[in-house]
């Protein structure tokens, strides 16, 4: 699990390379993670944190590595926090991207820096 | 708990290939990446190469055109190869694995012993 | 490539006493505000083990002892107190950037 509060990061920037990150992801053809599933999460209610969360039960999968990075950047929470989940939902990695993706362009156009 | 063990030849001819096989239990290798490591006799460890669980492969620049790593994720084992041997090849290797981010090698095998030698 | 240097490349250290290795990295291996450099025990006749990740990060079943800190392109592990179980051999890794590289080691003797 991710370890102590990372240092600062420019936010903007930092959102702008996971948007541009996830673009990248999302056009790619091939299954993303062998297929692997996830638990789906409230983003709008936890944000980063919650993304980061689920997304860290994923493992051996390069083509999320930088994600994963950014969104440990992003997540400034001291401990992981339970993953609030909706009700026994996993969906695909791939699935999971976009909906982050849109979550984030989303938070890049109207979120106050 | 995820083991690893290597299994090769021990000895092998100067300019010969070496092939080596890594055999993973406890984890699928479709999600579980695999880093290979080796060590001649009393120095450092020198990192080769890995192959990640969703088949990105990556190699130590300085022997990538020596280098072959491969896997069968069915017979969870994962192969290194390496060709045209010299006698500064002779080390221990080692394969480790790093299952989850961030990826530090958290499991390693015992390794297996190889000398270049005629 | 990234290139670690360690120091110093051996040690004695007396029991009870604390012991410190230093790691350099020839660029940083800081990424949105993590450290990728992880440390590594090896004793005589054995693996390595993973200690530390993410340069100050305990890992599991790892002694408190045993801690790292530092941050871009210098980090430190540090033993204190020593025990006469810590003689063995310590290298830095890091995996910011491929491909991933080693420290040169530093091994430690208990007087």
């Known amino acids: 699990a991710p370890g102590p509060v990372p240092r600062s990061v420019s936010l903007p920037l930092t959102l702008k390379e996971l948007i541009e990150e996830l673009s990248n992801i999302t056009q790619d053809q091939t299954p993303l993670c062998n297929g692997s599933m996830v638990w789906s999460v409230d983003l709008a209610a936890g944000g980063f944190c919650v993304a980061l969360e689920s997304l860290i039960n994923v493992s051996g999968c390069n083509a999320i590595y930088r994600t994963q990075r950014i969104l440990h950047g992003l997540c400034n929470r001291k401990a992981p926090t339970t993953v609030s989940s909706l009700p026994d939902t996993k969906i695909e990695v791939a699935h999971f991207i976009t909906k982050l993706l849109s979550y984030t362009k989303q938070l890049f156009r109207h979120g106050p820096f | 708990q995820v083991q690893l063990q290597e299994s090769g030849p021990g000895l092998v001819a100067p300019s010969q290939s070496l092939s080596i096989t890594c055999t993973v239990s406890g984890f699928s290798l479709n999600a579980y990446s695999v880093n290979w490591v080796r060590q001649p006799p009393g120095k450092g460890l020198e990192w080769l190469g890995m192959?990640?669980?969703?088949?990105?492969?990556v190699y130590n620049s300085a022997l990538k055109s020596r280098l072959n790593i491969s896997k069968d994720s069915s017979k969870s084992q994962v192969f290194l190869k390496m060709s045209s041997l010299q006698s500064d090849d002779t080390a221990r290797y080692y394969c480790?694995?790093?299952?989850?981010?961030?990826?530090?090698?958290?499991?390693w095998g015992h390794g297996t012993s190889v000398t270049v030698s005629s | 490539n990234i290139v670690l240097t360690q120091s110093p490349a051996s040690l004695a250290v007396s029991l009870g006493q604390r012991a410190t290795i230093s790691c350099r990295a020839s660029?940083?291996?800081?990424?949105?505000?993590?450290?990728?450099m992880h440390w590594y025990q090896q004793k005589p006749g054995q693996p390595p083990k993973l200690l530390i990740y993410?340069?100050?990060n305990l890992e599991s079943g790892v002694p408190a002892r045993f801690s790292g800190s530092g941050s871009r392109t210098d980090f430190t592990l540090t033993i204190d107190p020593v025990e006469a179980d810590d003689a063995a051999s310590y290298y830095c890794?890091?995996?910011?950037?491929?491909?991933?590289?080693f420290g040169g080691g530093t091994k430690l003797e208990i007087k």
């Open positions: 192959i990640w669980g969703d088949g990105k492969i």
């Open positions: 480790a694995g790093d299952g989850y981010y961030p990826y530090a090698m958290d499991n």
């Open positions: 993410l340069a100050s």
């Open positions: 890794q890091q995996n910011n950037e491929d491909p991933r590289t």
């Open positions: 660029k940083s291996v800081d990424s949105y505000g993590n450290s990728f």
